[in-house]
Interface confidence: low
C-alpha cells in the first residue's frame, strides 16, 4: 500500500541502491518513487551533518522485506517511496531553494530580473534540468541577476552548496509547463543517431517513449522491433541525446521506430507506467515470487500490489496451470525493464501499475472540451479519436474519417472501401488536426485487416459499418485516444449534446477542408427522419441528425467519421457518418449508422481477431 509518513531524525541502515544530491527530502522522495528499485530513502539536510560531501545526500534504498532498520541521526529525514500512491505520484517539483547553489554543467548564462523568470527559462530550454539564480544582493556584482541553466548525467545536482543570495530550482517540464511543445509522432522505419544515454529492453516503442520521457537525459529514442535483423538487438530501446537537443541525423531503417521524449509536452504528460498487456510474450528478469492466479489481469494486479514487482509473465503452459489458475511470475530487474523478451510463447506479460497516477487506465476518455457544412475549426486534442483515412496510389488524398476505438482498431463506414478494399493502399493518420501538416515523413498506420459488415451492399445504405485492424497498436496520447462505445442496444439515453467532426466538404460542391471541422447537431427521431426520406428505409440501426432549416451537416469526406454525444461528462460514439441527400439541405438530416445496434458485431469481430476485446466501452 501507499505509505506517506516521514521519519524525522531517522536514517535507514543498509539497502543502498543509489545516492545523489537533492535540495530537500521531498525531492529525494520523488527520486525514490521514480527509481525502479527504491522503496525507502534517507536524506541528510545540510544542518544534519558536518561532512561536506554528505550534505544534501539522498540515499535510495531497497529491501526484500519492504523495511530496513532505522538508526537515530539528528536532522536526517527518512521515508517511503510513493509507488502505489496514485495521484500523489508526480515528477513535478516547483520549489525554489533560497541560499542554495545546485551545481552541475553550466551550459547557458543570461541576465534575468527574477528567479521565476530563470525557472521559466530552464523550463523552456530542452536540455535544462535545474538552475541557479544569483540575486541582486549577491556578493559579486558581475554575477548579480545571472541565471545559470544546468544539467547533469543523472538529472540531479552533482553537488549542492550553501551560498547566500543564490536561489536554485528545477525545470518545470515534468509539470507539463514547457513552452517548447513536444513531438507526438512515432517514426516508423527510422533510426536516430547521436549519443546513447541508456539501453533498455521494451516490448514496443511506446514503452520505450515513456521510459525516455522520464529518463533525465533522454531527448529522443530509437526502438528496434522484435523482427529487427540483428537478433541481439531486438526490442532494444536506445535512449538518446544530442547537444542540439534534436537528432543530428536519421536513417531509413526497416524495423526500427524512433520518436521523442514527451517531457516537453504542454498541458499533459504520459503516465509514468505501462498498462498494456502483451499476449504471447515472456518477460525475463529476477524472480520475485510465483503465484497461481486466474487470468492475466489478476496477475497484473498481483504485481501492482507487490511493491517490488516491476513486471510479470502469466504462463498458460499446461504444466503451469491447475484448474482455472495458472502461474503468475512476478519479476524485477536493476533498471525496471525486462532482461529478456521472448515472443511466440504461451505467456502474457506486462508491467506493474504501481506508478500509474490515475489508477484505472481502461476508463473512457471524458475530455470536456468541446468540412462539415456550417462548422468551425477544431482545436488540438478536442477530438482525439478522429482519424483521417487516406489513399495513396499515384497521389495521396483524404477519403474518409474514422474513429479510434482501441489501440489497434478504427471504426468507420463500409462505403469508404467501395472499390478500394486493398489494404496496402490505405494510410491512416491519427493525432492530427491539419491535413496540410501531413508530409511524406508523417507517420501513419497501415491496415492489417479490413472487416466490412457481412450484410453491407455497395448499392444500399444498410449496415454501413466497417472495422479496421491496424498493423501496429497505437499509443494513447492527449491527441490520439479512443472514443467510448455505447452500451449494446442503447435506446433509453437521450442525447442532447452531439457533434459531428471531419475534414469533408464545406458545401455540396466543395473541397476537403484543411483544419478538422466540428458542428453541433441535434439528433432527430427516426420517425421524423423517415418523413424526410420517403424513398428510403430508415431502419432502427440508423440514427439521424440535423437542423430543420439545414445549414449544418456532414458532407463528402466526412463519411466514416464520428457522431459523438456527451452524456454525464463522457463522450460516446453514437453514430458513423453514412449518407444523406446532398449536404445541409433544409429538412434533409444526415443519416448515421447507429453504433449501439452493432455492439455485438463489433465485439465479436474484435475478439475473434484478437482473442480479447480491446474496445473502449463504458462497461
Amino acid at each position: 500500500g501507499c505509505l506517506t509518513q516521514l521519519y524525522e531524525n531517522a536514517f535507514f541502515r543498509g539497502g543502498d541502491v543509489a545516492s545523489m544530491y537533492t535540495p530537500n527530502a521531498q525531492y529525494c522522495q520523488m527520486r525514490c518513487t521514480f527509481h525502479p528499485r527504491c522503496l525507502l530513502f534517507s536524506f541528510l539536510p545540510a544542518s544534519s551533518i558536518n561532512d561536506m560531501e554528505k550534505r544534501f545526500g539522498c540515499f535510495l534504498k531497497d529491501s526484500v522485506t519492504g523495511t530496513l532498520p532505522k538508526v537515530h541521526r539528528t536532522g536526517a529525514v527518512s521515508g517511503h517511496s510513493l509507488k502505489q500512491c496514485g495521484h500523489q505520484i508526480s515528477a513535478c517539483h516547483r520549489d525554489i531553494y533560497k541560499g542554495v547553489d545546485m551545481r552541475g554543467v553550466n551550459f547557458n548564462v543570461s541576465k534575468v530580473s527574477s528567479v521565476e523568470e530563470c525557472q521559466k527559462r530552464c523550463t523552456s530550454n530542452i536540455r535544462c534540468q535545474f538552475f541557479s539564480y544569483a540575486t541582486q544582493t549577491f556578493h559579486k556584482a558581475e554575477y548579480r541577476n545571472n541565471c545559470l541553466l544546468k544539467y547533469s548525467p543523472g538529472g540531479t545536482p552533482t553537488a549542492i552548496k550553501v551560498l547566500s543570495n543564490v536561489e536554485s530550482g528545477f525545470s518545470l517540464k515534468p509539470c507539463a509547463l514547457s513552452e517548447i511543445g513536444c513531438h507526438m509522432n512515432i517514426f516508423q522505419h527510422l533510426a536516430f543517431s547521436d549519443v546513447d544515454v541508456a539501453r533498455v529492453l521494451t516490448p514496443d516503442a511506446f514503452v520505450c517513449r515513456t521510459i525516455c520521457t522520464y529518463h533525465p537525459n533522454c531527448l529522443f529514442f530509437t526502438f528496434y522491433t522484435n523482427v529487427w535483423k540483428i537478433e541481439s538487438q531486438r526490442n532494444v530501446c536506445l535512449l538518446k541525446t544530442s547537444e542540439s537537443g534534436t537528432p543530428s541525423s536519421s536513417t531509413p531503417q526497416e524495423n526500427t521506430i524512433s520518436g521523442y521524449s514527451l517531457l516537453t509536452c504542454k498541458r499533459t504528460l504520459p503516465e509514468p507506467c505501462h498498462s498494456k498487456i502483451y499476449p504471447g510474450v515472456d518477460f525475463g528478469g529476477e524472480e520475485l515470487n510465483v503465484t497461481f492466479v486466474k487470468g492475466v489481469n489478476v496477475c497484473q494486479e498481483t504485481c501492482t500490489k507487490m511493491i517490488r514487482c516491476q513486471f510479470f509473465t502469466y504462463s498458460l503452459l499446461p504444466e503451469d496451470c491447475k484448474e482455472e489458475k495458472c502461474k503468475c511470475f512476478l519479476r524485477l530487474s536493476m533498471d525496471g525493464s525486462p532482461t529478456r523478451i521472448a515472443y511466440g510463447t504461451q505467456g502474457s506479460s506486462g508491467y506493474s501499475l504501481r506508478l500509474c497516477n490515475t489508477g484505472d487506465n481502461s476508463v473512457c476518455t471524458t475530455k470536456t472540451s468541446t468540412r462539415i457544412v456550417g462548422g468551425t475549426n477544431s482545436s488540438w486534442g478536442e477530438w482525439p479519436w478522429q482519424v483521417s483515412l487516406q489513399v495513396k496510389l499515384t497521389a495521396q488524398r483524404h477519403l474518409c474519417g474514422g474513429s479510434l476505438i482501441g489501440h489497434q482498431w478504427v471504426l468507420t463506414a463500409a462505403h469508404c472501401f467501395d472499390g478500394l478494399p486493398l489494404q496496402d493502399v490505405w494510410r491512416i493518420y491519427s493525432g492530427i488536426l491539419n491535413l496540410s501538416d501531413i508530409t511524406k515523413d508523417t507517420p501513419f498506420s497501415q491496415i492489417k485487416e479490413i472487416i466490412i459488415h457481412q450484410n453491407y451492399k455497395v448499392s444500399e445504405g444498410n449496415h454501413d459499418i466497417a472495422l479496421i485492424k491496424l498493423q501496429a497498436p497505437l499509443n494513447y496520447t492527449e491527441f490520439q485516444k479512443p472514443i467510448c462505445l455505447p452500451s449494446k442496444g442503447d435506446t433509453s439515453t437521450i442525447y442532447t449534446n452531439c457533434w459531428v467532426t471531419g475534414w469533408g466538404f464545406s458545401k455540396e460542391k466543395g473541397e476537403i477542408q484543411n483544419i478538422l471541422q466540428k458542428v453541433n447537431i441535434p439528433l432527430v427521431t427516426n420517425e421524423e427522419c423517415q418523413k424526410r426520406y420517403q424513398d428510403y428505409k430508415i431502419t432502427q440501426r440508423m440514427v439521424c441528425a440535423g437542423y430543420k432549416e439545414g445549414g449544418k451537416d456532414a458532407c463528402k469526406g466526412d463519411s466514416g467519421g464520428p457522431l459523438v454525444c456527451k452524456h454525464n461528462g463522457m463522450w460516446r460514439l453514437v453514430g458513423i457518418t453514412s449518407w444523406g441527400e446532398g449536404c445541409a439541405r433544409r429538412e434533409q438530416p444526415g443519416v448515421y449508422t447507429k453504433v449501439a445496434e452493432y455492439m455485438d458485431w463489433i465485439l465479436e469481430k474484435t475478439q475473434s481477431s484478437d482473442g480479447k476485446a480491446q474496445m473502449q466501452s463504458p462497461a
Epitope: 547521436d194 546513447d196 539501453r199
Partner: antibody, heavy 119, light 107 residues
C-alpha cells in the same frame, strides 16, 4: 577533418595480450558507433567488434568472443581493443573505424596498426 | 552468418574500360550493402552505401545497383587511380561480413 589514429600494435607471443588504442578527432566521438576491423596479410577484411556510443552495447565476432574486449572513453575520444589469449591467426592489421548511423556503413577508417602473434 | 561472394576475384582492365564487379549474398539483405575501395598499404575507403548511394566526394563514375541477394558495382570509365581491391559488405545482420574482394589490375 575526421581522423582516426591507431596505436599499440606490435609483436606478441601466442597467449599474450595487447591493448590497441584509437585516438579520434575532427568529429563528436561520443555520438558514433565505433568498430574494429582486421585484415590478415594478403587476405580480406574481417569485422572484429563494435561498440555503441554509450559504451554499454558491444558486439564481437565469434572468432574473438571471450578473448577481446572493446571499450571507449568518450571523455578522451579514444577507442580501445583489449586482446587477450592471442593466437597466430590473430595476426593482422587492425583498423579502427567509424560507423555512420544505422545503415552500418563504415565511413572513416584509421590507417591501421599491425599486430603480429608469433613465437 | 550471411556469406558474401564476390566475383571475379581479380580482373585485368585498361584505362577507360567499363568494369563491373558483382556481389552475391547468401540470403536477402534488402539494400543493406556497401562497397569499399582499398589500395595497397592503405585503409579501405567507402564508395557506395545502401546498395546505390554514392558517398560524398566519390567520383560519379562509380555506381551501385541491386537489391535482395545480387548487387553490382560499376566503374563506367576506369581511371589510373581506380586500380585497387574492391570489397562489398552487408549490414543487414550481425556479424557484418565482407566479400572476399576483387582485385582490379592493369592489363
Amino acid at each position: 577533418e575526421v581522423q582516426l589514429l591507431e596505436s599499440g600494435g606490435g609483436l606478441v607471443q601466442p597467449g599474450g595480450s595487447l591493448r590497441l588504442s584509437c585516438a579520434a578527432s575532427g568529429f563528436t566521438f561520443s555520438y558514433y558507433t565505433m568498430l574494429w576491423v582486421r585484415q590478415a596479410p594478403g587476405k580480406g577484411l574481417e569485422w572484429v567488434s563494435s561498440i555503441y556510443p554509450s559504451g554499454g552495447f558491444t558486439m564481437y565476432a565469434d572468432s574473438v568472443k571471450g578473448r577481446f574486449t572493446i571499450s571507449r572513453d568518450n571523455s578522451k575520444n579514444t577507442l580501445y581493443l583489449q586482446m587477450n589469449s592471442l593466437r597466430a591467426e590473430d595476426t593482422a592489421v587492425y583498423y579502427c573505424a567509424r560507423v555512420d548511423t544505422a545503415m552500418a556503413m563504415i565511413d572513416y577508417w584509421g590507417q591501421g596498426t599491425l599486430v603480429t602473434v608469433s613465437s | 552468418d550471411i556469406q558474401m561472394t564476390q566475383s571475379p576475384s581479380s580482373l585485368s582492365a585498361s584505362v577507360g574500360d567499363r568494369v563491373t564487379i558483382t556481389c552475391r549474398a547468401s540470403q536477402s539483405i534488402s539494400s543493406y550493402l556497401n562497397w569499399y575501395q582499398q589500395k595497397p598499404g592503405k585503409a579501405p575507403k567507402l564508395l557506395i552505401y545502401a546498395a546505390s548511394s554514392l558517398q560524398s566526394g566519390v567520383p560519379s563514375r562509380f555506381s551501385g545497383s541491386g537489391s535482395g541477394t545480387d548487387f553490382t558495382l560499376t566503374i563506367s570509365s576506369l581511371q589510373p587511380e581506380d586500380f585497387a581491391t574492391y570489397y562489398c559488405q552487408q549490414s543487414y545482420s550481425t556479424p557484418i561480413t565482407f566479400g572476399g574482394g576483387t582485385k582490379v589490375e592493369i592489363k
